[in-house]
């Protein structure tokens, strides 16, 4: 069964800067990745970035740099200030659309005990939805 993992890290140098890393553990070909915050995309969450393997990367503030890390993982840097700044308990979600598996989404947030600059290891997060 395919899985999605999500890792959230707060940067030590800037407390309003977060790095989100997501990966897809499956054999299919990824056709789209959507990163959102505040909940799953389409279920109250707000889209931060859309990464298409052929068409490019569309991102919304406070997303600063979204990129492909590998064929099946992405990273996103957020730099917020004021109302658009993420906070320590913000939930981030990643949805991977792949062929032939369909869509798989998981969410994660900063581990409660994390110090800035630290993060939990990238373990698979609970699968919230498989379309």
């Amino acid at each position: 069964t395919p899985e999605v993992w999500v890792q959230v890290r707060m940067e030590a140098t800037e407390l309003s800067s977060f790095t989100i890393r997501c990966g897809f553990l499956g054999s299919g070909s990824i056709s789209l990745v959507t990163v959102s915050w505040g909940g799953p995309n389409g279920a109250g969450g707000t889209t931060l970035a859309v990464l298409h393997p052929e068409r490019g990367i569309r991102q919304w503030a406070p997303a600063r740099q979204a990129r492909w890390e590998t064929q099946s993982s992405i990273s996103l840097i957020l730099e917020g200030s004021g109302a658009s700044s993420p906070c320590a308990n913000t939930t981030f979600c990643c949805k991977f659309a792949s062929f032939p598996e369909g869509s798989w989404e998981a969410c994660g947030s900063l581990p409660p005990s994390s110090d800035p600059g630290l993060s939990a290891p990238p373990t698979p997060a609970p699968i919230l939805r498989a379309d």
Partner: antibody, heavy 120, light 113 residues
Framework: QVQLQQPGAELVKPGASVKLSCKAS????????MHWVRQRPGQDLEWIGE????????NYNEQFRNKATLTVDKSSSTAYMQLSSLTSEDSAVYYC?????????????WGQGTSITVSS | DIVMTQSPSSLAMSVGQKVTMSCKSS????????????LAWYQQRPGQSPKLLVY???TRESGVPDRFIGSGSGTDFTLTISSVQAEDLADYFC?????????FGGGTKLEIK
């Protein structure tokens, strides 16, 4: 063929607002994001933002977030950009442009541009 | 934001000559997923709007003469006009079309001697 029609010029007073139009024809209007680009005299092209005509979803360049507001009217296949609190720095040619079908940000069809002059 | 730098800012060539102009990006435009470079070139003739010539660094837009050749990878790109014509008098802009916000170079003005 694809056409994006824009008015030629507008003269506006400092502090005022202006709403620019871009009427699309020759393709399925809801299927392509519409982009707006600024070109000040002798300066670089600057991307202002984009709007998805199918659902009104917008995306702005941060430096224009408080200056420009993008909307569409699907029934007339027209995109609009409202510019507020105009100053002489906003005097420029403003283009609407359609994104290329195979990539988000290459722009394959452009309007002729609307020249905005801000002067009292 | 990705910064695009073009050189030279202007050049004057005679009809029939080969023209090359450069564009550099502050970060790589190579997408590791599909090995495509997200770099476009536009031509803007005097008093006209920009026209897309090349995208994905080397793919010519439909209807663009084959004397326009885009090349390069990563951060260094070149537009070559193999045999310049009088109608090529224009400003040429490069643009990264990889991620938001798309950004443009300052342009190269081509004058015909």
């Amino acid at each position: 063929q694809v056409q994006l029609q824009q008015p030629g010029a507008e003269l506006v007073k400092p502090g005022a607002s202006v709403k620019l139009s871009c009427k699309a024809s020759g393709y399925s209007f809801p299927s392509y994001w519409m982009h707006w680009v600024r070109q000040r005299p002798g300066q670089d092209l600057e991307w202002i933002g984009e709007i998805n005509p199918s659902n009104g979803l917008t995306n702005y360049n941060e430096q224009f977030r408080n200056k420009a507001t993008l909307t569409v009217d699907k029934s007339s296949s027209t995109a609009y950009m409202q510019l507020s609190s105009l100053t002489s720095e906003d005097s420029a040619v403003y283009y609407c442009a359609r994104h290329h079908g195979s990539t988000y940000y290459a722009l394959d069809s452009w309007g002729q541009g609307t020249s905005i002059t801000v002067s009292s | 934001d990705i910064v695009m730098t073009q050189s030279p800012s202007s050049l004057a060539m005679s009809v029939g000559q080969k023209v090359t102009m450069s564009c550099k990006s502050s970060q790589s435009l190579l997408n590791s997923i599909n090995q495509k470079n997200f770099l476009a070139w536009y031509q803007q003739r005097p008093g006209q709007s920009p026209k897309l010539l090349v995208y994905f660094a080397s793919t010519r837009e439909s209807g663009v003469p084959d004397r326009f050749i885009g090349s390069g990878s990563g951060t260094d790109f070149t537009l070559t006009i193999s045999s310049v014509q009088a109608e090529d008098l224009a400003d040429y802009f490069c643009q990264q079309h990889y991620s938001t916000p798309p950004t443009f170079g300052g342009g190269t003005k081509l004058e015909i001697k």
